[in-house]
Structures are given as structure tokens and as C-alpha cells.
Amino acid sequence: APTSSSTKKTQLQLEHLLLDLQMILNGINNYKNPKLTRMLTFKFYMPKKATELKHLQCLEEELKPLEEVLNLAQSKNFHLRPRDLISNINVIVLELKGSETTFMCEYADETATIVEFLNRWITFCQSIISTLT
């Protein structure tokens, strides 16, 4: 059974994941982002179901494509590079989903834009956090 300290740790990790996903989304949605139109042409796989931490496997599998799309913003001077953000997200995802059980991700039939993809995982984080508080 999860202890209050492990629940607190999970909540903090989810909050950090949420913050970095929101940061990426904000940067993409910035009206001054000249690469937004091109970024929106890339398609991402969406999870068929995302209600438990094990479903983060579906996010993990899309992190490399996400980094590649974010690298389109190469004309900017980065405080944080896309690889810094993706690396941190990857570490959090691995800790949250655990490695005890192998979960095969099932994807929805329709793909999504980067904005829809990020919004989906932001909603996931918010939903899980709400069950922990």
C-alpha cells in the first residue's frame, strides 16, 4: 500500500512533469514563435487510454519525436535546450511509471498535433494529481 510519503513524492514528481509540459506548450504557443506553423505539421501518437501512471509509457515513447520537433526552434538562444527539458521529463516518467511491469502502450487511431499531444498529457497530470490531493 502506498505510504503518505510515497504519495507526496509521486505528487511532487507529477507537479514537476506538469510544469515542464506546460512550459514547452507555452513556448510553442508564443505568438512570436515563427516555427509554430511547421511544428503543427508533425503528428504525434495519442494514448487510447491514459488514466494510470503505467500509461506514461505512451508519453515516454513519444519523447524522442517531441525533442526533434522542439529542435526546430534552433534560431533561439536557449536558457534550456529541448534536450534538457526532455531529459528531465524522461527521468520523471521513468520514476513514475516504474519498471516492475512491462506495459504495452495502445495508441488511438488518430494522430494529433504537438499542441493537442501536450494538452492531453497536461490533462493527464492534472487528473492524477487531483486524485492524490
Epitope: 514537476h16 515542464d20 507555452n26 513556448g27 534550456l80 534538457d84 528531465n88
Partner: nanobody, 119 residues
Framework: EVQLVESGGGLVQPGGSLRLSCAAS????????MGWYRQAPGKQRELVAA???????NYPDSVKGRFTISRDNAKNTVYLQMNSLKPEDTAVYYC?????????????WGQGTQVTVSS
């Protein structure tokens, strides 16, 4: 408006340590990047370390393994622990607050704190 107050600079011998702090106040959003840049006389401003509110960090090779950035989101404060300092680390260190991971005209900068590494 965002106000940034830096502290912790000073004179230190080569091989020594210093800890810089920067507290942000004003129109702070929960999603942000805070960090440190430095500028030595006659040189361009350069990144020292940056950290997102979610914990993502960036260090240039010149400080990797020697400097550690951390933050307290509840206090809107960022810290820079500088170990194994070298004379070439001498510069004015500026705290930075940004709403995105890339540079923007809406970024905010502190007044700067002098770090001098000399025997």
C-alpha cells in the same frame, strides 16, 4: 514587473566555494525558468546555469561538475552553488527570470553581483 534580488557574491581564493542566491518577487508565474548568466570585462554575457520550475537544468561545459543550480519554487528563489572556483570564473553574475525556455524580450535581469576569484 518582476524584481530580482541577488546576494552571495564576493572575493574567494582559487579552489574555494561560494553560494549565490536570487529571490524573485512581483508578477511571478508558476511556469518559469530562473538562472544565472555572467559577464567578465570585455567579454559577452554567457550562460552559467538555468533551471525550470519543473527541475530541468542546463549547464555549459565550462561549469559542469563544479556548479550546481537549485531552486525553491515556494520561495521563488534560485541558488547557485559554485565549487572549485577558478580565476576565469571572475565576473559579474546576473540572475535571470524568464517565462519560456528560450530568450525573449520579456526576460528579467537582476542588477548583478561581483564574484572575484583571486589569491
Amino acid at each position: 514587473e518582476v524584481q530580482l534580488v541577488e546576494s552571495g557574491g564576493g572575493l574567494v581564493q582559487p579552489g574555494g566555494s561560494l553560494r549565490l542566491s536570487c529571490a524573485a518577487s512581483g508578477s511571478i508565474f508558476s511556469i518559469n525558468v530562473m538562472g544565472w548568466y555572467r559577464q567578465a570585462p570585455g567579454k559577452q554575457r554567457e550562460l552559467v546555469a538555468a533551471i525550470s520550475s519543473g527541475g530541468s537544468t542546463n549547464y555549459p561545459d565550462s561549469v559542469k561538475g563544479r556548479f550546481t543550480i537549485s531552486r525553491d519554487n515556494a520561495k521563488n528563489t534560485v541558488y547557485l552553488q559554485m565549487n572549485s572556483l577558478k580565476p576565469e570564473d571572475t565576473a559579474v553574475y546576473y540572475c535571470m527570470y524568464a517565462s519560456s525556455w528560450y530568450e525573449d524580450e520579456t526576460d528579467y535581469w537582476g542588477q548583478g553581483t561581483q564574484v572575484t576569484v583571486s589569491s
